[in-house]
Interface confidence: medium
């Protein structure tokens, strides 16, 4: 996350780190007891690699009563997703067992009305991405506000060049924007999750780049088919 | 590139020992899962042997025609997989490929292959 | 083992029209992890085979849309909604749920 600051720690209890190897590797939101929705590109490199989820974290390395890493039973990518395109690039995790709910450990609703968020509407991004262009990786979750912006504009030729179709949204990136190691994270707009961050190698923290976002929304009947 | 280049095919007589070499370039080879695929002159394909990666203990497992003959090894640090076939038998002519295995456990890049004969 | 029965053989098809291989397996080809390991790969002549379809219905990078991949349990299907000059070849099904893995017999798809 570029130009936020640490979140309020267990405060999104709905949060994820998927982890490959132990270590982070992208964000992911809690949708049902044993699913945590991500970005598809995520796991494209995974290789023959061990991928486990993280819940009830706010600290990645410190001790944390709430922290419980989950072994994936099961990775299943949006049939469409593919690895050169920013098209229904979701994934679904299926935990080997149901988390453990608490106060730091909770599934956040989702946007099932398949309606556009209004552009200027205030938006939370959260995430252990990068927090800065020289790379650093912050241990502490951090978290920044947003403003939705309309689709004409993000499609401009200057910006995104009619790369956002109406399964994708966007949001501000005007020196504060997600990043790397954010993608697959949660987009929260009034306490529902509204978006997905994408995990394409788009420039962050530049206004003519603002961040993609996946829309849940337009995704509802597959992800009912999947947690079904 | 992502490139995958086997090597050390020939002709060798019923009984004989050989050992194919696969070169990985383009990619962590050490994160992957590799696998030999085969296909004899004129017919389909067939899985022979996988290996995994250091995070996997460097799992073997074998097709029922091959096991107790052939050992798969692996060497990360020259980015390079063998395939050791001893006790070779006519049947086991055939173009060898080496294949990586991605994530969602799919052969997503695929050798030109190496051709193994066996004949007395 | 699991046997992979794939059916036509030979597929003759006029360019532009739809094609369709069907591929059944001897027993269930859900992993135990709840994923169904199974793939389609073309082979064309004188190539080494190339990825199409994974886990049943997801289109591997740069495979266009007219190919499908549809089933489950044991019963799959790979459907090309209108044949292209590019895509004749030997197309094999593939599942990678079971040790040991085990291809299809292939289905050679053909100008008529």
């Known amino acids: 996350i570029l130009g936020g600051r640490e979140a309020e720690a267990h405060a999104r209890p709905y949060m994820a780190s998927v982890q490959l190897n132990g270590a982070h590797l992208c964000g992911g939101v809690l949708v049902a007891e044993q699913w945590v929705l991500s970005a598809a590109h995520c796991l494209e490199d995974a290789a023959d690699g061990k991928v486990q989820v993280l819940l009830g974290a706010h600290s990645l390395s410190q001790p944390e009563p709430s922290k419980r890493l989950y072994d994936v039973l099961r990775a299943v990518p949006h049939p469409d997703s593919q690895p050169d395109t920013i098209d229904h690039d979701l994934l679904l995790l299926q935990l080997s067992e149901k988390a453990t709910l608490g106060p730091a450990v909770r599934p956040l609703p989702w946007q099932r009305v398949d309606r556009d968020v209004a552009p200027g509407t205030l938006c939370d991004v959260a995430g252990w991405g990068i927090v800065n262009h020289a790379g650093r990786r912050p241990d502490s979750l951090q978290h920044v506000l947003l403003p939705v912006l309309d689709r004409a504009t993000c499609n401009r030729r200057t910006h995104h060049d009619g790369a956002i179709t109406e399964r994708l949204m966007c949001a501000e990136s005007n020196r504060r924007d997600s990043c790397k190691g954010d993608s697959g994270g949660p987009l929260v707009c009034g306490g529902v999750l509204e978006g997905v961050v994408t995990s394409g190698s788009r420039v962050c923290g530049n206004r003519k780049k603002p961040g993609i976002y996946t829309r849940v929304a337009s995704y509802a009947a597959w992800i009912d088919s999947v947690l079904a | 590139a992502v490139q995958l280049v086997e090597s050390g095919g020939g002709l060798v007589q019923p009984k004989g020992s050989l050992k194919l070499s696969c070169a990985a370039s383009?990619?962590?080879?050490?994160?992957?899962?590799m696998n030999w695929v085969r296909q004899a002159p004129g017919k389909g394909l067939e899985w022979v042997a996988r290996i995994r990666s250091k995070s996997n203990n460097y799992a073997t497992y074998y097709a029922d025609s091959v096991k107790d003959r052939f050992t798969l090894s692996r060497d990360d640090s020259e980015s390079m997989l063998y395939l050791q076939m001893n006790n070779l038998k006519t049947e086991d002519t055939a173009m060898y490929y080496c294949v990586r295995q991605g994530f969602y456990w799919y052969f997503d890049v695929w050798g030109t292959g190496t051709t193994v004969t066996v004949s007395s | 083992d699991v046997l992979m029965t794939q059916t036509p053989l030979s597929l003759p098809v006029s360019l532009g029209d739809q094609a369709s291989i069907s591929c059944r397996s001897s027993q269930t080809i859900v992993h135990s992890n709840g994923n169904t390991y199974l793939e389609w790969y073309l082979q064309k002549s004188g190539q080494s085979p190339k990825l199409l379809i994974y886990?049943?219905?997801n289109r591997f990078s740069g495979v266009p849309d007219r190919f499908r991949g549809s089933g489950s349990g044991t019963d799959f299907t790979l459907k090309i909604s209108r044949v292209e000059a590019e895509d004749l070849g030997v197309y094999y099904c593939?599942?990678?749920?079971?040790?040991?893995?085990?291809f299809g017999s292939g289905t050679k798809l053909e100008i008529k």
């Open positions: 593939f599942q990678g749920s079971h040790v040991p893995y085990t």
């Open positions: 886990n049943v219905s």
């Open positions: 383009g990619f962590s080879f050490n994160t992957y899962a």
